[in-house]
Interface confidence: low
């Protein structure tokens, strides 16, 4: 399914853009990559409120969204092998652009410890309920979709697009209508803060009244982290309205002349920039020149500042930014070292766990210690990581290899097991002869016995499960597979078709099997192939039968 | 400076509509919610409803549910609202307030208000 | 709704003294770790003006002898030494939840 861009939010360096559309995480984040961001992070309170605002304003014009609760995919993710971490606030998860683990969570109940599979996070909203801005939505984690399957309940993404700076947007001292046009090819009339690179098309005018005017204006960075549209005055101005139509497009002051013109001007302590419109102030820290936590510091007199860095960080070449210092480069850590703000962080490789003897050590997880263990049946701990195996008579199954599933002996691909009925059961399997033959003590072959018309040999009933497997002693039991707890069997009878020659006796077993040919005291090699008789269990009216378990290896006994 | 300027008094009958508008200057108008709150004789205050500028979304108490409607007009900064149906008890003073965008939305800049006086 | 109870619902003093003013809500205003509870004053014939914010941020220019504590459903609004033009009414407002509601108020006379 497409995705629609429904709504965007640009505030601070970044623009948000919400879509709808039922896809995937990795169609999504492929989506809002193909023009230039990602799935969006919430890395604060104030990002969510961001995401909240984009949110609000696409399920407002979004008619469709019939779901009660609804999820929005976000860019937070947790590979395949890498487990949960309770400890940190992002429980292992990580966010799609990189960067460090971030404090803010707001989780939607507790997680599940899995590591088998990859897992993606999306936003939960209410749709019940109104988007209260102090109601930030949840982070809800689960299976990530796949083409054509998206996912419980998604109905849609939410991207990031970052930027260098944003233009304010123009002011319109008269009628007309702006249309910009974002690098992420989102068209808008109403944004708070215009990204760098954007385009601006403004139509003067009242539509049919008069005559349309067009400019066109290109958000450009006129100086370091000073971006401005290179406009001169407020546009579309008319003598008709004057200062009247939106304050005359000026930021702060409209003086009018005499003739209907007019001029922006500022309040004290503030001055006109370049563009007529705009007033800054005449403090130079009220531009924020300084970047990356770095604090404007007036000098003597006002006139001019110096910028100074928090403790653990230090000015740039450019004396306006705070960089931090890398205490990785002293390697105290025993495996990853992380980098962070003012400080760093010791990290352990996916399948360790902080701990052990020294600052940033890291220990083995055990995977299969007593309720942990991923695995169905058999567990195998190793350093840094874990293997799943199977009993005898089943074989690893599942996407991640931590299931185990029978082994039907009966269709393998080495061929028949059995030289005649063979029974699958769970993790094992039970040979057993046409009726007037008998099993072999090696419980594969079947020999000659007493003339009999019965049916043949089946698996034993539920009351005879105390015997041993293994024996090849010839019990009374019926071909009909006895029946596990819910009701499906347990054991199929399959059986391998002899070639047939012309004097080939036919006996009257419900089975509608036929005797094997050659000689009457040797069961012959089956010639074709295994295939389970009839289409179902049949209801045999009793007899004798000869039957015997074996492992897959063909040995006789238990597992 | 920050300011928001209320239109003048009303009297109006009961059964009809009154339209007040809210002006505001000294900041960016579409960066605010806007929220209308009105105060009867000797009563609390009383949240009627909010709209978001910059997109005109509204948010109403469900007690005036159907006989309020806010919307705003950018160009001109203002922003209005309508009750209908008036009847006594809607005598009030009637304010415009503004609020953060984000959050907790306290009204930080309040209008001086409107008294609006319905009587037969 | 929730329900916003202010108590007392008048209170002499005098200057100089410190006054203390309740407000108790139906249900909990507190949300991810902040309180959604907010501190209007009020003269005769005037609009309301905001003092505290998020039941104990002091609203710019507020005078620092207004404060406000509290979390849940309960909070306070302290004036630690009353001065002329404190006398007023105070109200408690929720922004938790639609509609927003506020107190009954608490009219603050000269002894």
């Known amino acids: 399914t497409g995705a629609d861009t429904e709504a965007v939010v640009c505030v601070g360096t970044a623009c948000y853009t919400a879509h709808s559309g039922k896809l995937s995480a990795a169609e999504a984040q492929n989506h809002c990559n193909q023009n230039g961001g990602n799935l969006a992070t919430v890395k604060s309170k104030e990002e969510a409120q961001h995401v909240q605002r984009v949110l609000a304003q696409l399920l407002r014009r979004e008619a469709a969204l019939t779901a009660r609760m609804s999820k929005f995919w976000i860019g937070l993710q947790r590979e395949k092998g890498k487990c949960l971490d309770p400890s940190l606030p992002l429980k292992g998860f990580s966010w799609v652009g990189g960067g460090e683990d971030t404090p803010y969570s707001n989780w939607h109940k507790e997680l599940r410890n899995s590591c088998i599979s990859k897992r993606c996070v999306s936003l939960l909203l209410d749709l019940s309920q109104p988007l209260l801005p102090s109601r930030l939505p949840k982070w809800s984690e689960g299976p990530c979709g796949s083409p054509g399957s998206p996912g419980s309940n998604i109905e849609g993404f939410v991207c990031k697009f970052s930027f260098k700076g944003m233009c304010r947007p123009l002011a319109l001292g008269g009628p007309g209508q702006v249309t910009y046009t974002t690098p992420f090819q989102t068209t808008s009339s109403s944004l708070e803060a215009v990204p760098f690179a954007s385009a601006a098309n403004v139509a003067c005018g009242e539509g049919d009244k008069d005559e349309t005017q067009s400019h066109y204006f290109l958000c450009k960075e006129k100086a370091p982290d000073v971006f401005d549209w290179g406009s001169s005055g407020p546009l579309c101005v008319s003598p008709k309205y004057g200062c009247n139509f939106n304050n005359g497009g000026c930021h702060q002051d409209c003086f009018e002349g005499g003739d209907g013109s007019f001029l922006c001007g500022c309040r004290p302590g503030f001055r006109l920039l370049d563009d007529l419109v705009t007033c800054a102030s005449r403090n130079p820290c009220s531009s924020s020149p300084c970047r990356g936590g770095a604090t404007c510091v007036l000098g003597p007199h006002g006139k001019n500042y110096t910028c100074r860095c928090p403790q653990g960080y230090q000015l740039d070449s450019s004396q306006l930014d705070c960089v931090d210092v890398d205490e990785c480069q002293d390697s105290p850590c025993a495996q990853e070292c992380v980098n962070t703000p003012g400080g760093f962080r010791c990290e352990c490789w996916v399948g360790y766990e902080p701990g052990g003897p020294g600052e940033g050590a890291c220990q083995d997880v055990d995977e299969c210690a007593l309720g942990r263990s991923p695995c169905a049946q058999g567990c195998t701990n190793t350093d840094g990581s874990f293997h799943c195996s199977c009993e005898e008579g089943y074989v690893l199954a599942g996407e991640d290899g931590t299931q185990c599933q029978d082994v039907d002996e009966c269709v393998g691909p080495g061929g028949p097991l059995c030289d005649s009925l063979c029974f699958n059961t769970q993790g094992s399997f039970h040979c057993g002869c046409l009726p007037g033959w008998v099993l072999a003590p090696n419980g594969v072959s079947c020999t000659m016995g007493p003339v009999s018309l019965g049916p043949p040999s089946g698996p034993p009933d539920e009351e005879d499960k105390g015997e041993k497997e293994g024996s090849t002693v010839p019990r009374a039991a019926t071909a009909s597979p006895t029946r596990g707890p819910e009701g499906t069997p347990k054991a199929t009878p399959t059986t391998s078709r002899p070639s047939l020659s012309s004097d080939a006796p036919i006996t009257s077993a419900p089975l509608k099997m036929l005797a094997p040919s050659g000689s009457p005291g040797v069961w012959r090699e089956p010639s074709i192939h295994h295939a389970t008789a009839a289409s179902g269990p049949q209801e045999p009216a009793g007899g004798d039968s000869s039957v015997a378990t074996q492992n897959n290896d063909g040995t006789d006994g238990q597992k | 400076q920050v300011q928001l300027v209320e239109s003048g008094a009303e009297v109006k009958k009961p059964g009809a509509s009154v339209k007040l508008s809210c002006k505001a200057s000294g900041y960016t108008f579409t960066s605010y919610w806007m929220h209308w709150v009105r105060q009867a004789p000797g009563q609390r205050l009383e949240w009627m409803g909010e709209i978001d500028p910059s997109a005109s979304y509204t948010y109403y108490n469900q007690k005036f549910k159907g006989r309020v409607t806010i919307t705003v007009d950018k160009s001109a900064s203002t922003a209005y609202m309508e009750l209908s149906s008036l009847r006594s008890e809607d005598t009030a003073v009637y304010y415009c307030?503004?609020?953060?965008?984000?959050?907790?939305?306290?009204?930080?800049?309040w209008g001086p208000g409107t008294t609006v006086t319905v009587s037969s | 709704d929730i329900q916003m109870t202010q108590s007392p619902s008048s209170l002499s003093a005098s200057v100089g003294d410190r006054v203390t003013i309740t407000c108790r809500a139906s249900?909990?205003?507190?949300?991810?770790?902040?309180?959604?509870m907010n501190w209007y004053q009020q003269k005769p014939g005037k609009a309301p003006k905001l003092l505290i914010y998020a039941a104990s941020n002091l609203e710019s220019g507020v005078p620092s002898r207004f404060s406000g504590s509290g979390s849940g459903t309960d909070f306070t609004l302290t004036i630690s030494s009353l001065e002329d033009e404190d006398f007023a009414t105070y109200y408690c407002q929720q922004t938790n939840e639609d509609p927003r509601t506020f107190g009954g108020g608490t009219k603050l006379e000269i002894k």
């Open positions: 307030a503004r609020s953060v965008y984000y959050g907790n939305k306290y009204f930080d800049v």
């Open positions: 249900q909990s205003v507190d949300y991810a770790g902040d309180s959604y």
